[in-house]
């Protein structure tokens, strides 16, 4: 079997939904040593970035300005070392937002509710589109989907403390073009009187997962590797 | 704005060489990444050479070893340097621009680039 390299992370650095005419920073982590990286958008190549020095770093950041709907899609990265190439990375999907309209989100019975009770939210959006999305704040990976004319629901069944937090919703054109978002709603939810003031709210910060850590290696870096390598061929 | 303006097409017979001028207006050449991309009669547009805003160049398969793409940030030009031609290389050449840029990007993808030339037609014919 043809040899390859281990294949590299792609994540999109602060979010993967990015505003049209704004800019998109994709990272594609490798490997030291790696002395090309590809950007690949829709299985044709996109981008490539060639560190410098490569032995210094372990990855690469791709700036894709002006985002529009030609740029919103599924992208992947691979690098290379010397004449090896790695397997692909994981897809990712970029979303290109503020497209068109602006929803307007609602929820029944209403934001404040207890726990147990059932809880719907309701997002509409006039101009024709069929798919609509609910993302819960500092949860965007977790879309919900739902679809309708004008207006998609997203029954929550009974809620718990967990649901609380802060809503939005977009409406579709396409997997890859949505609207602006609405306003948010705020989910209010009351638990028991022994744990309502201890149930925790969800994070309102950006998703954790959604950052670059790319390093530069130190000459302590390396010299632990090489110590490491020295020790890995004692213990042999 | 950036506006870009290509030169150098013309008739050439195969294995004749041409060089190619696109000159952008506007303060932000140097921060802009610029490639080159043809499209024959009745074909789809093809990307051909790209070059980042430090100089890291990539070019097609198909004219590698053949076209050089340089750059001239001082005139605020790019240029693409055709030799060995072939019947195959008849089409209208665009540059292209992204701006900006960071870091040291080459741009390979036509959905990629936001500004277009009107382009120039080269024609390699005995």
């Known amino acids: 079997p043809k040899q390859t390299l281990p294949k590299p992370i792609i994540r999109a650095e602060s979010t993967y939904m990015v505003p049209k005419e704004k800019q998109a920073t994709l990272c594609c982590q490798g490997s030291y040593g790696a002395v090309e990286y590809q950007l690949h958008f829709e299985g044709s190549l996109f981008a490539v970035e060639r560190p410098k020095p490569p032995e210094r770093i372990n990855g690469v950041k791709f700036h894709i300005p002006d985002m529009n709907s030609r740029k919103a899609g599924r992208y992947s990265c691979i690098y290379r070392v010397g004449e090896l190439w790695s397997e692909r990375s994981d897809l990712l999907d970029l979303v290109v937002t503020e497209m068109y309209d602006t929803p307007t989100l609602s929820v029944h019975p209403g934001p404040e509710v207890t726990s147990g009770e059932k809880v719907t939210f309701y997002c509409r959006l006039d101009t024709a589109t069929s798919m609509f999305l609910l993302l819960k704040e500092g949860r965007s990976r977790d879309v919900q989907r739902s679809y309708g004319k004008v207006q998609a629901e997203f029954p929550m069944g009974p809620v718990t403390t967990a649901h609380r937090g802060s809503y939005r919703c977009f409406g579709s054109y396409n997997n890859y073009a949505w609207s602006f978002p609405s306003e948010p709603v705020k989910l209010l939810v009351t638990g028991d009187i022994e744990n309502t003031s201890l149930a925790p709210t969800d994070p309102t910060f950006p998703d954790s997962w959604d950052t670059c850590l790319l390093t530069r290696e130190t000459g302590l870096q390396k010299d632990l590797a090489l110590w490491d390598h020295t020790a890995q061929n004692l213990l042999r | 704005e950036v506006q870009l303006v290509e030169s150098g097409g013309g008739e050439v017979q195969p294995g004749g060489s041409l060089r190619l001028s696109c000159a952008a207006s506007?303060?932000?050449?140097?921060?802009?990444?610029m490639g080159w991309f043809r499209q024959a009669p009745g074909k789809e547009r093809e990307f051909v050479a790209a070059?980042?805003?430090?100089?890291?160049?990539y070019y097609a398969e198909s004219v590698k070893g053949r076209f050089t793409i340089s750059r001239d940030n001082a005139k605020n030009t790019v240029y693409l340097q055709m030799s060995s031609l072939r019947a195959e290389d008849t089409a209208v050449y665009y540059c292209?621009?992204?701006?900006?840029?960071?870091?040291?990007?080459?741009?390979?993808?036509?959905?990629?680039?936001?500004?277009w030339g009107q382009g120039t037609l080269v024609t390699v014919k005995p």
């Open positions: 506007g303060r932000t050449f140097a921060s802009a990444a």
């Open positions: 292209a621009a992204v701006v900006p840029t960071y870091g040291n990007t080459i741009y390979v993808h036509s959905a990629a680039y936001n500004y």
């Open positions: 070059i980042s805003r430090s100089d890291d160049t």
